[in-house]
């Protein structure tokens, strides 16, 4: 039974997107009063694992020496103190890449684009898939995806971007997946470098002009709403 204890923090190192066969460590950080840590995996018998705290007792380590599809999924952790069990942590989604062959990522009409114009990133898989994800390196919200609404299998997904601005420039990769597990992704596509030239930009300085530090919906190809009735793909914001 969840008590009034504050929830612990759950994270993965080196990250939550792990290639098949690589090692990953899941950390759960509670309080100095913690006596035991428990890790639960969604749709698996609880507890998935238990660990004694590491000194000074405020965290525990859960090791996965070699990433496989069995480890992909959603995790939460708890800690037990003398007064009972804590609230659950926020969920950690551990994703495995390398489950399917890599898709191809291209830019239409070209990866060289002028500010103020549009570009469409096209992710194509050899076999039909129902989820396509686009990742921009160093973006604040790197995961965007198109998912089939009715199990319709697709060989490709289009990610439209407009108007293109300087913050769209950078390196993109895409993944494909099957809807039965959102946590199993293909190998990443080869990187695509999008280069934005600024010939359409207003040359006058603006008093509010600043460097954009967050890559958000405007400089991502998707928005958190909407659907694609003709292709059967639905947009999701991750």
């Amino acid at each position: 039974q969840a008590g009034p204890l504050p929830k612990p923090t759950l994270w993965a190192e080196p990250g939550s997107v792990i290639s098949w066969g690589n090692s990953v460590t899941i950390w759960c950080q509670g309080t100095l009063e913690a006596r035991e840590y428990r890790l639960d995996k969604e749709e698996s018998p609880a507890p998935w694992d238990r660990q004694n705290p590491l000194e000074p007792k405020n965290k525990a380590r859960f090791s996965i020496p070699s990433m496989t599809e069995d480890y992909a999924g959603r995790y939460r952790c708890y800690y037990r103190s003398p007064v009972g069990w804590s609230q659950p942590s926020d969920p950690l989604e551990l994703v495995m890449t390398g489950a399917y062959s890599k898709p191809t990522l291209s830019a239409l009409p070209s990866p060289l684009v002028t500010s103020g114009k549009s570009v469409t990133l096209l992710c194509q898989s050899r076999s039909p898939m129902d989820t396509f994800l686009l990742i921009k390196e160093r973006a604040a919200h790197p995961l965007l995806h198109l998912r089939s609404e009715h199990g319709a299998q697709q060989h490709q997904a289009e990610f439209p971007m407009s108007p293109v601005t300087s913050v769209h420039g950078g390196t993109y990769r895409c993944f494909s997946s099957h809807g039965f597990s959102h946590y199993l992704l293909s190998h990443p596509s080869d990187p695509l470098e999008l280069i934005v030239s600024g010939s359409l930009e207003d040359p006058r300085p603006s008093p509010t002009r600043s460097v954009s530090t967050a890559a958000g919906p405007e400089d991502q190809p998707l928005m958190p709403t909407g659907s694609v009735p003709h292709s059967g793909l639905r947009r999701h914001w991750e």
């Epitope: 549009s118 604040a140 439209p160 601005t165 300087s166 913050v167 190809p221 292709s231």
Partner: antibody
Amino acid sequence: EVQLVESGGGLVQPGGSRKLSCAASGFTFSVFGVHWVRQAPEKGLEWVAYISSGSNTIHYADTVKGRFTISRDIPKNTLFLQMTSLRSEDTAMYYCARSSGTGAMDYWGQGTSVTVSS
Amino acid sequence: DIQMTQSTSSLSASLGDRVSISCRASQDISNYLNWYQQKPDGAVKLLIYYTSRLHSGVPSRFSGSGSGTDYSLTISNLDQEDIATYFCQQGNTLPWTFGGGTKLELK
């Protein structure tokens, strides 16, 4: 719920100035580009200006270039349109609209009316 | 600039009808075509973006199609609340431009 509320409209003399504001709420203002669009009485919609999320990209319609300035105050979640050297043909309902990032404007304000007349 | 043309400025239809509104661009806009609804009170709403993608909360009776320079909006089962003016807009290149609008009226 996404909300955009324009203000600052009114009657202005030809050659005069006016500053419109658009207060945004219900979303993270700092990560969306925003547009101004206008509609003259009994006419269609006309795109006026765009400012990107970080204000580092700005575009204007040729009809307002050099006279209008779009800007934003991110801490205050507010978009502005400074209009100078106003002409009778600038008489319109002015709307602010959020840029979807996909070439569309996905949420619009209710508009504020500007009348340029002597 | 890209010119957008809605050849029909007004259209009369009955409740329950299937209605199509067309829009033509002066050059290929690569599917960056959006449809908006403007009610008599002036309120504007996005219906369809990127030719055929339904915006959040928009009834499924609205659909869009087209490619290149020719696009259309279809309302499959006209409802009383659909009586409005419909505008197409290209989002391919700034300056973004709108069609002149098609006013939908009841017969």
